[in-house]
C-alpha cells in the first residue's frame, strides 16, 4: 500500500501544498482554537503557496473559497421563527418538539439495544472460535500473540468485557499469568474500538458527514493502536503495569464489594432478553480447554434450573487417576473413584424468540447480525434525521458553543480534561465504552461535536470502561478477586499511560491528525473505510497470529523487514515534508514509485471494476441497504430518493480550482486527490429518477 495514499500527482516542491490536504501536513495546526467559532460563515480562504519561478501562478483564477471540510457545518434553520408563530403554531411546534424528543429517545433506545444484540450475534458467529484462540499455549511466551488474540477475540465477540472476563477466569484458574494477560487486555482495548467504526460506516451516504463521523470513530482506533505500539514494548521490557498493579493489590486488603451498578442494562435488558439470551460461560469453558463445551450451544434454553450436588462412582484407568487416595478402590475388575457431580435439573425455559427453534449458533448469529445491523443503521439514520431537524439555527449555536468552546484563559487547557471526566462518567453510567463512543459518532458526523472535543471524550470513555471493570472485580468471589482486580487495574493504568502519551501536549495528539487523514481518504474513496476495517481488525491480527503459530523465527523473519520498511517510509515522509533539500532529487517526492504504490486511484479503478454492476446506477431501494451500495459504488446521490439514481460522479470530476491552460502545465496541476477535498454540492445533489 502507498505510504500516503493521496500522492497521485505530487508537485516538484513536495512541502508546498494547499491547506487542508490529506496527510500533507503532519504538523497541521491544532484546530481546537477554531472551535470557538459557532457560525462558520467565514470559511478560511485556501492558501495558495507561492510556487517556484517556473510556475505560472497567474494561470490560476482568483482563488475560490474552498470550505475546510473539518469546519463544523452551519445547520440553517429554514423554519418560521418562534416569535412569528401564532398560538396554534406555537402549540403545534411544542408538541412537535415533544414528539421529536420521544422519537429521539426511542430510536436511541433501539440503537443501544441493537448494539447489544450485535454483540450477541458476533458471539454466536465467532464466540467459540474466540474461545479457542485463548486455548493456544504460546500466549504465555509471546506478548505479540497475546495482543492479536485480544484484538481478534474482542472483535469476534464485540465486547471487551467478555474477553476480559475470560482472561480473568483463566488467570484465577492459573491457566494464564498476569504477565501474559496484559497484552491480551491491550488487544481487547483495540478490539472494542471496532464498534463505533462500524457505526460510522452507516453514515456513508453523505461525504462530509462520513468524513467527520469516520474520523471521529477512528480517533479511538488510532489512540489504542499508538498506545499499544509504544506501551507494549515498554511493558515487555519493564513490566511496569504488572509491578504497579501488584503493589496496589498487595497493599490493600480488599473486601468483596457489590456489583457495579447496571444502569443502562436495566432499561435495555427487558427488550434484548426477548430477542436472544446467551450462556456466556460456554466461551470461557472453551478457553479453558473444556472439551464438552465445544458441543454446547451459546443460545440459552433453560433460564430456571435446579442444581443438585451428588457423589457418583466412576471408573478410572488406574488408581493414579483417583480423585483422592481415600476415595479409590477396585471391584476386582475395574478401578473406581468417587466424583462430585453437579446434577442440573431444568425447570423453566427462557422467554426469547430463538428458544424453540433449535437452530445452530451460526444460523441464529447470522440472522441476528443482519437484523441488528439493519436496526442499527435504521436507528442511526433516524437519529441523524431527528437531530438534524432539531439542531438548527439558534439551538445548534447554543449546543455547539456549550460542547466545543474552551474555558476562558488561563483555564482553557482544563476543558479537555473536563471532557475526559465527562466521557468517563457517561461511560460509567451506560456501562459500555462501545455504546458511548457509538452514540458520539453520529453527533460528530452531523457536526455537533468537533473531533478535537470528541477525542478527550473518547479517552474518558476508555477510562470509564476500566472503572466499571474495577468495580466488577471488587465484586468477584474470593478466588478471582486478586486476579480480576489486578487485570482491571492493568487496563486502567494502560489507558492512563496512553492518555499521558497522546493528550497533554497538543503536538502529541497524533490520533486526531491520523484520523483526519483517514477521514479525508475515506470520504474520497469510501470503499477504503471497509478496507481499513478489514486490514486493521482482521488481516493484520490474523497474519501476526499465523506467523506466531509458525514460530518466533518466522515472526521475526517476516516482521523485522516489514517494520523496517514502515520506519523507512515514515522517516522519508518526515524528511519530505520538513527538510526535502537533504534528500536527493528523486526522493523529494513519491513519483519514483509506480502509481499503484503511491495513490489509491488505480485501486479505485479495480474496486470500481468489481462493483461495475453498481457503477452506472445505484439502486437505493431502501434507505438502509443503499448504505452498502454507497460503499461499493461510491454513488454520490445515494439515499436522497427511494428510486434508482444515475451516477453523475464523472461529470463532476472536473469541477475544481479553474485552471486556464492545464494541459500545458500539467507538472503543477494541483489535483483534488492531493487535497482530499470534495465540493460540498457533491453529496447534496438530488437523485435523478430513471
Amino acid at each position: 500500500m502507498a505510504p500516503w495514499p493521496e500522492l497521485g500527482d505530487a508537485q516538484p516542491n513536495p512541502d508546498k501544498y494547499l491547506e487542508g490536504a490529506a496527510g500533507q501536513q503532519p504538523t497541521a495546526p491544532d484546530k481546537s482554537k477554531e472551535t470557538n467559532k459557532t457560525d462558520n460563515t467565514e470559511a478560511p480562504v485556501t492558501k495558495i503557496e507561492l510556487l517556484p519561478s517556473y510556475s505560472t501562478a497567474t494561470l490560476i483564477d482568483e482563488p475560490t473559497e474552498v470550505d475546510d471540510p473539518w469546519n463544523l457545518p452551519t445547520l440553517q434553520d429554514s423554519g418560521i421563527k418562534w416569535s412569528e408563530r401564532d398560538t396554534k403554531g406555537k402549540i403545534l411546534c411544542f408538541f412537535q418538539g415533544i414528539g421529536r424528543l420521544i422519537l429521539l429517545l426511542g430510536f436511541l433506545y433501539f440503537f443501544v439495544c441493537s448494539l447489544d444484540i450485535l454483540s450477541s450475534a458476533f458471539q454466536l458467529v465467532g464466540g467459540k472460535m474466540a474461545g479457542q484462540f485463548f486455548s493456544n499455549s504460546s500466549i504465555m511466551s509471546n506478548p505479540l500473540l497475546g495482543l492479536v488474540i485480544g484484538v481478534l477475540v474482542t472483535v469476534l465477540v464485540q465486547s471487551s468485557s467478555t474477553s476480559t472476563s475470560i482472561v480473568v477466569s483463566m488467570v484465577s484458574s492459573s491457566l494464564l499469568t498476569v504477565r501474559a494477560a496484559i497484552p491480551i487486555i491491550m488487544g481487547a482495548n483495540i478490539g472494542t474500538s471496532i464498534t463505533n467504526t462500524i457505526v460510522a460506516l452507516m453514515q456513508v451516504g453523505d461525504r462530509s458527514e462520513f468524513r467527520r463521523a469516520f474520523a471521529g470513530a477512528t480517533v479511538h482506533d488510532f489512540f489504542n493502536w499508538l498506545s499499544v505500539l509504544v506501551l507494549l514494548p515498554v511493558e515487555v521490557a519493564t513490566h511496569y503495569l504488572e509491578i504497579i498493579t501488584q503493589l496496589i493489590v498487595e497493599s490493600f486488603h480488599f473486601k468483596n464489594g457489590e456489583d457495579a451498578p447496571d444502569l443502562l442494562k436495566v432499561i435495555t435488558k427487558p427488550f434484548t432478553k426477548l430477542i436472544v439470551q446467551l450462556d456466556k460461560k460456554v466461551i470461557s469453558q472453551i478457553a479453558m480447554n473444556d472439551e464438552k463445551a465445544k458441543n454446547k450451544s451459546l443460545v440459552k434454553i433453560w433460564c430456571k434450573t435446579f442444581t443438585n450436588k451428588t457423589q457418583i462412582n466412576v471408573t478410572v484407568p488406574s488408581t493414579a487417576n483417583c480423585t483422592s487416595p481415600s476415595l479409590c478402590w477396585t471391584d476386582g475388575i475395574q478401578n473406581w473413584t468417587m466424583k462430585n457431580v453437579t446434577y442440573k435439573e431444568n425447570i423453566a425455559k427462557c422467554q426469547h424468540i430463538f428458544v424453540n427453534f433449535h437452530l445452530p449458533d451460526l444460523a441464529v448469529g447470522t440472522i441476528l447480525l443482519i437484523l441488528s445491523l439493519l436496526v442499527l443503521c435504521g436507528c442511526l439514520i433516524m437519529i441523524v434525521k431527528i437531530l438534524g431537524s432539531v439542531l438548527k439555527g439558534q439551538v445548534a449555536t447554543v449546543i455547539k458553543k456549550t460542547i466545543n468552546t474552551d474555558f476562558p484563559f488561563p483555564f482553557a487547557w482544563l476543558t479537555g480534561y473536563l471532557a475526559i471526566l465527562v466521557g468517563a462518567g457517561m461511560t460509567f453510567i451506560v456501562q459500555s465504552s462501545s455504546v458511548f463512543t457509538s452514540a458520539l459518532t453520529p453527533l460528530i458526523g452531523i457536526g455537533v461535536i468537533t473531533i478535537e472535543r470528541a477525542y478527550p471524550l473518547t479517552l474518558g470513555s476508555n477510562i470509564g470502561t476500566t472503572t466499571t471493570a474495577i468495580l466488577a472485580a471488587l465484586a468477584s468471589p474470593g478466588n478471582a478477586l486478586r486476579s480480576s482486580l489486578q487485570i482491571a487495574l492493568c487496563h486502567f493504568f494502560f489507558n492512563i499511560s496512553g492518555i499521558l502519551l497522546w493528550y497533554p501536549i497538543p503536538f502529541t495528539r497524533l490520533p486526531i491528525r491520523m484520523a483526519k487523514g483517514l477521514g479525508n481518504i475515506s470520504a474520497k474513496y469510501r470503499w477504503f473505510a471497509v478496507f481499513y476495517l478489514i486490514i486493521f481488525f482482521f488481516l493484520i491480527p490474523l497474519t501476526v497470529f499465523g506467523l506466531s503459530l509458525a514460530g518466533w523465527r518466522v515472526l521475526v523473519g517476516v516482521g523485522v523487514p516489514v517494520v523496517f520498511i514502515i520506519i523507512l517510509v515514515l522517516c522519508l515522509r518526515l524528511l519530505q515534508s520538513r527538510c526535502p533539500r537533504v534528500l536527493p532529487k528523486k526522493l523529494q517526492n513519491w513519483n519514483f514509485l509506480p502509481l499503484w504504490m503511491r495513490s489509491l486511484k488505480p485501486w479505485d479503478a479495480v474496486v470500481s471494476k468489481f462493483t461495475g454492476c453498481f457503477q452506472m446506477r445505484c439502486c437505493c431501494c431502501c434507505r438502509v441497504c443503499c448504505r452498502a451500495c454507497c460503499l461499493l459504488c461510491d454513488c454520490p446521490k445515494c439515499c436522497r430518493c427511494s428510486k434508482c439514481c444515475e451516477d453523475l460522479e464523472e461529470a463532476q470530476e472536473g469541477q475544481d480550482v479553474p485552471v486556464k491552460a492545464p494541459e500545458t502545465f500539467d507538472n503543477i496541476t494541483i489535483s483534488r486527490e492531493a487535497q482530499g477535498e470534495v465540493p460540498a454540492s457533491d453529496s447534496k445533489t438530488e437523485c435523478t429518477a430513471l
Epitope: S324, C328, W329, T330, D331, I333, Q334
Partner: antibody
Framework: QVQLVESGAEVKQPGESVKVSCKAS????????MHWVRQAPGQGLEWMGA????????GYSQKFQGRVTLTVDKSASTAYMELSSLRSEDTAVYFC????????????WGQGTLVTVSS | DIQMTQSPSFLSASVGDRVTITCSAS??????VAWYQQKPGQSPKLLIY???TRHTGVPSRFSGSGSGTDFTLTISSLQPEDFATYYC?????????FGQGTKVEIK
C-alpha cells in the same frame, strides 16, 4: 434371596484341569461381579479373580494369571472357573462369591467346592 | 501386592467381653477395607465394608474403624455365636488380599 450353588467335589491328578460351576439365583446375575476365592485346608482366604457377567470383563490375581479362566453363561445364570495345570498345592475349597455393587467386597458366598489334587 | 497383617492370630475371650482385632496394611488403602466372619465348616460372611459400614443384617455389636493403613474390628460384647475366625480384606487395587485371620476362642 441370593443363592449360589456350586458343583460337587472333584478329585484330579496333577497336570489336569478342573472346571467348577456356580449357579446363581435370587438377583440379576448380569449386574454383579462374580469372584472366586479359595481356601487351602487350615489356611486363610486367597482371591483368584473376578468376572462381570454383563460384559464378560475379567480381572485376575497375578498369581493365577494364565492358569485360571473365568467364564459365564448368562442364559443359565451360571459362572465357571477353570483351573489348569493342577498341582498338589491347588488342593482347596473353591468359593464363588457375589461381589458388592461396584465394590471389591464379597457379599454372598457359595457353599464351596472341594478340589483335591493327588497322584 | 498389598499385604494385610492381622493381630493377634489367636484370641481367647469370654462371653460379654469387648474384643478388638487389628489389621495393618503394607500401604495406604484409604477406607477400602472389609471384615469377614467364618465359622468352622461354613462359608465366610461379610460383616463390615468401607472400614466402618455394617453389612445388612449384621448386629450392632460389630463395629469397624480406621483408615489409611491401620484398621480395627471391635465386638463390644462377645456372644456365644461370635466365636469364629475373622478376616480383614482390602479392595484398594488388584489383587484383593486377605489377612491371615484371627481365631476367637472361648476362654
Amino acid at each position: 434371596q441370593v443363592q449360589l450353588v456350586e458343583s460337587g467335589a472333584e478329585v484330579k491328578q496333577p497336570g489336569e484341569s478342573v472346571k467348577v460351576s456356580c449357579k446363581a439365583s435370587g438377583y440379576t446375575f448380569a449386574s454383579y461381579n462374580m469372584h472366586w476365592v479359595r481356601q487351602a485346608p487350615g489356611q486363610g482366604l486367597e482371591w483368584m479373580g473376578a468376572i462381570y457377567p454383563g460384559s464378560g470383563n475379567t480381572g485376575y490375581s497375578q498369581k493365577f494369571q494364565g492358569r485360571v479362566t473365568l467364564t459365564v453363561d448368562k442364559s443359565a445364570s451360571t459362572a465357571y472357573m477353570e483351573l489348569s495345570s493342577l498341582r498338589s498345592e491347588d488342593t482347596a475349597v473353591y468359593f464363588c462369591v457375589r461381589g458388592g455393587r461396584g465394590l471389591g467386597t464379597m457379599d454372598y458366598w457359595g457353599q464351596g467346592t472341594l478340589v483335591t489334587v493327588s497322584s | 501386592d498389598i499385604q494385610m497383617t492381622q493381630s493377634p492370630s489367636f484370641l481367647s475371650a469370654s462371653v460379654g467381653d469387648r474384643v478388638t482385632i487389628t489389621c495393618s496394611a503394607s500401604q495406604d488403602v484409604g477406607s477400602s477395607v472389609a471384615w469377614y466372619q467364618q465359622k468352622p465348616g461354613q462359608s465366610p460372611k461379610l460383616l463390615i465394608y468401607w472400614a466402618s459400614t455394617r453389612h445388612t443384617g449384621v448386629p450392632s455389636r460389630f463395629s469397624g474403624s480406621g483408615s489409611g493403613t491401620d484398621f480395627t474390628l471391635t465386638i463390644s460384647s462377645l456372644q456365644p455365636e461370635d466365636f469364629a475366625t475373622y478376616y480383614c480384606q482390602h479392595y484398594r487395587n488388584i489383587p484383593l488380599t486377605f489377612g491371615q485371620g484371627t481365631k476367637v476362642e472361648i476362654k
